[in-house]
Amino acid sequence: LTCLGGFASPGPVPPSTALRELIEELVNITQNQKAPLCNGSMVWSINLTAGMYCAALESLINVSGCSAIEKTQRMLSGFCPHKVSAGQFSSLHVRDTKIEVAQFVKDLLLHLKKLFREGQFN
C-alpha cells in the first residue's frame, strides 16, 4: 500500500507555483529576521539576469550552518539545471562585491516578484 501511494503523488509543480513558493519562502525569511541573517555572513553579489537562479545558488551554497536559508538553497536547486557545489562560481557573480545574506535575499526577492508580475517563470 505504501508503494501504491506513490501513484497518487502530484506531477511536476507548474513553474508559476514553484516561483510563487520561492517568493513566499524569501518573504518568510525577511519577515522572521530577528538577529542578523546567517550571523551577517557575506556572499558574492550576482547579476540578476538569465541564469541567475544558478548564480544565486552558487553564492548561497557557500554559507554553511545557516538553517534559515537551507530551504531556499533546496528550492533554488530546483530552478538550476546543473549540480552546484560550494566553491563554484559563474560569470554572473559580481566578483568584487560581497553583500550580507540579508541584502542578497532582499534583492533576489524584489527581482523574483517582478518576474512573477511579468509572467516569467523559467
Epitope: 508559476s16 517568493i23 513566499e24 539576469t49 516578484k113 517582478k114 512573477f116 508580475r117
Partner: antibody, heavy 125, light 112 residues
C-alpha cells in the same frame, strides 16, 4: 513621505520633441515600476508605457512605439518620458505614477498607487 | 488591445444612496500568473488620479470601506455603498494583465 514631482508645463512646435521628468522621493525607484499616463483635454486616461528602473526594461503601447522613450536614473531617483515627432493630438497632461513592491507580502503589486501632479504639454504652431 | 468598456458613462446619485459602475473587458484578463490585475481609479476635478481598488477587490490603504470591487474573467463592478458629496469625479477601470495595459473610458459620478 512618498512624492512624485514632475517638471513644468511645456509649449512645443509640431515635429519637435519633449522630455518630461518625474523626481521621486520617499522610496527607492529600483523597488518599483514607473509608468507614464496621459490625458488629452476633456478626455480619459491613456497608459503609454512603463519602465523597471532596476534594469531599464520597458513596455510601450504599440501606438507610441518608436516615438516614446521612457528612461530612469537610479542615482537621481528620476524617471523620464520623451515623446518625439510631436503633433497637435499630443497636447495633453502627462502623469508619472509608480507601482511599488514591498518585502512583506508574497504578492504585493500595488498598481499605480502614487501619481505625479501632471505636466501639461501643449503642441501648437 | 483589450478594450475596457464602462457603464454608465454618467451616474447621478443622491447622497446616502448606493452606486454601482460596471466594467467589461473585451477578453479575459486573468494574468498568466493567476492574478487578475483589474484596478479602479478616481480622478477628482483638477486632480491627479488616485488608486481605489487593485486586483479586483483589494482596497488600497486609506480608501473607505464604502468602496468595494468584485467580478472575474471579463465582468467587474465597483460599488459605493453610500455615496458622499466628496465622491464626485470620474471613475476609471484599468487592466494591467495584458500589454498594452488599458483604461476604461471613465464614468462621471455626480451628485443629484
Amino acid at each position: 513621505q512618498v512624492q512624485l514631482v514632475q517638471s513644468g508645463a511645456e509649449v512645443k512646435k509640431p515635429g519637435s520633441s519633449v522630455k518630461v521628468s518625474c523626481k521621486a522621493s520617499g522610496f527607492y525607484i529600483k523597488d518599483t515600476y514607473m509608468h507614464w499616463v496621459r490625458q488629452a483635454p476633456g478626455q480619459g486616461l491613456e497608459w503609454m508605457g512603463t519602465i523597471d528602473p532596476a534594469n531599464g526594461n520597458t513596455k510601450y503601447v504599440p501606438k507610441f512605439q518608436g516615438r516614446v522613450t521612457i528612461t530612469a536614473d537610479e542615482s537621481t531617483s528620476t524617471a523620464y518620458m520623451e515623446l518625439s515627432s510631436l503633433r497637435s493630438e499630443d497636447t495633453a497632461v502627462y502623469y508619472c505614477a509608480r507601482s511599488i513592491f514591498d518585502d512583506y507580502h508574497y504578492d504585493d503589486y500595488y498598481a499605480m498607487d502614487y501619481w505625479g501632479q501632471g505636466t501639461l504639454v501643449t503642441v501648437s504652431s | 488591445d483589450i478594450v475596457m468598456t464602462q457603464s454608465p458613462l454618467s451616474l447621478p446619485v443622491t447622497p446616502g444612496e448606493p452606486a454601482s459602475i460596471s466594467c467589461r473587458s473585451s477578453q479575459n484578463i486573468v494574468h498568466i500568473n493567476g492574478n487578475t490585475y483589474l484596478e479602479w481609479y478616481l480622478q477628482k476635478p483638477g486632480q491627479s488620479p488616485r488608486l481605489l481598488i487593485y486586483k479586483i477587490s483589494d482596497r488600497f490603504s486609506g480608501v473607505p470601506d464604502r468602496f468595494s470591487g468584485s467580478g472575474s474573467g471579463t465582468d467587474f463592478t465597483l460599488k459605493i455603498s453610500r455615496v458622499e458629496a466628496d465622491d464626485v469625479g470620474i471613475y476609471y477601470c484599468f487592466q494591467g494583465s495584458h500589454v498594452p495595459w488599458t483604461f476604461g473610458q471613465g464614468t462621471k459620478l455626480e451628485i443629484k
